[in-house]
Amino acid sequence: GSERTCCPVNWVEHERSCYWFSRSGKAWADADNYCRLEDAHLVVVTSWEEQKFVQHHIGPVNTWMGLHDQNGPWKWVDGTDYETGFKNWRPEQPDDWYGHGLGGGEDCAHFTDDGRWNDDVCQRPYRWVCETELDKASQEPPLL
């Protein structure tokens, strides 16, 4: 496929990635699906610099990222290694709290109002951020 060399309209370019910031809320699974349909993924935070960039754009609002432990261990949606990668959890998080009584634990990660991360009930409709990398092969066939 052809390579994406510039960001789509309404996406923000930063360090060879494109970001789209929602202004509405979706459950984590619905946000994940939205990004996939855009040939992107929920944002994967790999550095303090990227954390600050995303935090600047979302403000003090709960916002989903591409990190979850719905199948056991914590995993980034693009396969980035969680154990060795950047982390910015709030103190004593993640706690996979079952005591909320809503069913299940807390399997999806979001930016909190101060930018640090928390695990929460995946069904809650929070804002979300999609990310796609420039220079990656897109799904579109090349022009002949």
Epitope: A29, H100, L102, G104, Q123
Partner: nanobody, 117 residues
Framework: EVQLLESGGGLVQPGGSLRLSCAAS????????MMWVRQAPGKGLEWVSD????????YYADSVKGRFTISRDNSKNTLYLQMNSLRAEDTAVYYC??????????WGQGTLVTVSS
Amino acid sequence: EVQLLESGGGLVQPGGSLRLSCAASGFTFAAYSMMWVRQAPGKGLEWVSDISPGGRHTYYADSVKGRFTISRDNSKNTLYLQMNSLRAEDTAVYYCAKMGSTTFDYWGQGTLVTVSS
């Protein structure tokens, strides 16, 4: 067929109160967590509050904490949202929603709350 029917919205002055109701049918209401969400004019969907199946556990968005109270009556298959100290920024269409395994899988048609003097 799952149905959720909200009522109780209307025009209220700043500082006033309203009580929203959501009548549920078509599923075992007492077995599911429920949620209130809202959408302000020209804005996106926002989580407001949710409640556990038995009603013992309740949670609120920071923007409504201390002013809104979610409750439920499982004998009447009804969800409530008591809204006090209303502000202009609470103006929105309010929806009740049933929490599924990965998302909120059903929601009603909404009831409009307008806070204005």
